[in-house]
């Protein structure tokens, strides 16, 4: 006859080992006991468990709890045992001694792996903001045995970079994702992706991209000079801009408060009917963390009742910003 | 101040493709993202994803093969494509405002206005 | 079954505080923002609550917020009749599925 067993068997962390140890005999043998046993090299042999046809199961005091049979219908052939809850500490090389009848005493080794799956972390990294050169984006660790793969799945352009630190029963391994911070990245995900062996399917972490910007400011409404006449009703100024985040709004004039009756809605200047005193400078404060920009504009109130001949000035603007 | 519309048909057939479109007055699509939420009846909300006023889109990820939301800034609207409905589309759709940053530590992401919702029912 | 857990419904009488909660876990509500929202029965929901504390403007103060964890609260205070309504928790989800979450949603009912 002959034992059959496997080369390797593999584990996940917390799940149940079967190690298989069968007598395949000839017709009339019989198995008289199985003796499992560690079998590392340089740490002797620590029994586990003894299988007898007669007296049953013994399990040695160290594995007490952790070694069983595996349930009926039992094969008097099989001298498979189960090894519960399987820890990093089990994996190794184990041997199953069988004695038979007739046939005498036989042996087979086989090795336990006990895989350990990983709990990736993703970290982001500092604030990202327009105008920074190549910046940490987000960096993902995952711990685990054998190493994990750590890989990212995005639309974005940049560049990865991975190190790993072995440890004496598993390996972690961290990748970090730069880039060049822009606008166009916003809202852009940027996914962790570990895969693993003792993974049912791969662990994913997603980070959404934002990068802090402010847009130079403008102001629309005054494209046509000859609207702003005494009178008119409905004018307005919009101030325009963009932002990450989205920036707020306040309107001032410069050269002096703004004239009653002017409201001021967000990003909006709303007029009442105009007047010679609505002429001025009007400045548009755009602001949000990052940054804040301005952009003035003169406002000339034509009256047709005044000299026809008089010049009037072109429309001016001006932008000044900085950053916070 | 700002205003959200939901519009688009009540009714759609299974299998067919669910369109809704938000239109935003009273300010201006740009520097914010844009989501669509949606609620069967009786039941809780259901983020379905976002858009940024650049195009950069976001699904979830239990809708995302049918899902396609765009941006139209001339006409300052966002639009919610759903396709291959079933009943269990079902719901009253919501578009938002998100205010959607993240500040170097945490996610500031929270939904600032709504739309009023418009029910779709999926029957034949 | 929802990513966010609340109890599905809490009751008060009038002028009593309630409170309701919302459990997560770290690739949530521990790492991230929460803020809540307030839906009256046939009505778009409101924003009630945002970055775990702050109230947007015209909301009164005895509606508060709380984060600690894996957890979030939402505190009423001095309970109206008027506060009778649904309210969900929110917030972004970093894992596997990752998107904005909301909590299953919580029925205050105000008695008497």
């Known amino acids: 006859g002959e034992l059959e067993t496997s080369d390797v068997v593999t584990v996940v962390l917390g799940q149940d080992a079967k190690l298989p140890c069968f007598y395949r005999g000839d017709s009339g043998e019989q198995v008289g006991q199985v003796a499992w046993a560690r079998a590392d090299a340089g740490e002797g042999a620590q029994e586990l468990a003894l299988l007898h046809s007669k007296y049953g199961l013994h399990v040695s005091p160290a594995y007490e709890g952790r070694v069983e049979q595996p349930p009926p219908p039992r094969n008097p052939l099989d001298g498979s045992v189960l090894l519960r809850n399987a820890v990093q500490a089990d994996e190794g090389e184990y041997e199953c001694r069988v004695s038979t009848f007739p046939a005498g005493s036989f042996q087979a080794r086989l090795r336990l792996r006990v895989l350990v799956p990983p709990l990736p972390s993703l970290n982001p990294g500092p604030a990202l903001e327009e105008g920074q050169g190549l910046t940490l984006a987000a960096s993902c660790t995952a711990e685990g045995s054998p190493a994990p793969s750590v890989t990212w799945d995005t639309e974005v352009k940049g560049t990865t970079s991975s190190r790993s630190f072995k440890h004496s029963r598993s390996a972690a391994v961290t990748s970090e994702f730069h880039l060049v911070p822009s606008r166009s990245m916003n809202g852009q995900p940027l996914t962790c992706v570990v895969s693993h062996p003792g993974l049912l399917q791969d662990q994913r972490i997603t980070h959404i991209l934002h990068v802090s910007f402010l847009a130079e400011a403008s102001v629309r409404g005054l494209e046509d000079q000859n609207l702003w006449h005494v009178g008119r009703e409905g004018a307005m100024l919009k101030c325009l801009s963009e932002g990450q985040p989205p920036p707020s709004y306040n309107w001032t004039r410069l050269d002096g408060p703004l004239p009653s009756g002017v409201r001021v809605d967000g990003d909006t200047l709303g007029f009442p009917p105009l007047t010679t005193e609505h002429s001025g400078i009007y400045v548009c404060h755009v602001s949000n963390e990052f940054s804040s920009r301005d952009s003035q504009v003169t406002v000339d109130v034509l009256d047709p009742q005044e000299d026809s001949g008089k010049q009037v000035d072109l429309v001016s603007a001006s932008h000044h910003h900085h950053h916070h | 101040q700002v205003q959200l519309q939901e519009s688009g048909p009540g009714l759609v057939k299974p299998s067919e493709t669910l369109s809704l479109t938000c239109t935003v007055s009273?300010?201006?699509?740009?520097?914010?993202?844009w989501s669509w939420i949606r609620q069967p009846p009786g039941k809780g909300l259901e983020w379905i994803g976002y858009?940024?006023?650049?195009?950069?889109?976001n699904y979830n990820p239990s809708l995302k093969s049918r899902v396609t939301i765009s941006v139209d800034m001339s006409k300052n609207q966002f639009s919610l494509r759903l396709s291959s409905v079933t009943a269990a589309d079902t719901a009253v759709y919501y578009c938002?405002?998100?205010?959607?940053?993240?500040?170097?530590?945490?996610?500031?992401?929270?939904?600032?206005?709504w739309g009023r919702g418009t029910l779709v029912t999926v029957s034949s | 079954q929802s990513v966010l857990t609340q109890p599905p419904s809490v009751s008060a009488a009038p002028g009593q505080k309630v409170t309701i909660s919302c459990s997560g876990s770290?690739?949530?509500?521990?790492?991230?923002?929460v803020s809540w929202y307030q839906q009256f029965p046939g009505t778009a929901p409101k924003l009630l609550i945002y970055?775990?504390?702050k109230r947007p403007s015209g909301i009164p103060d005895r509606f508060s917020g709380s984060k600690s964890g894996t957890s979030a609260t939402l505190g009423i205070t001095g309970l109206q009749t008027g506060d009778e309504a649904d309210y969900y928790c929110?917030?972004?989800?970093?894992?596997?599925?990752?998107?904005?979450?909301f909590g299953g949603g919580t029925k205050l009912t105000v008695l008497g």
């Open positions: 938002a405002r998100d205010f959607h940053h993240y500040d170097g530590s945490a996610y500031r992401w929270y939904f600032d206005l």
């Open positions: 009273g300010g201006s699509i740009s520097s914010y993202f």
């Open positions: 858009i940024y006023y650049s195009g950069n889109t």
């Open positions: 770290s690739s949530n509500i521990g790492n991230n923002y």
């Open positions: 970055d775990n504390n």
């Open positions: 929110g917030t972004w989800d970093s894992s596997l599925n990752a998107g904005w979450v």
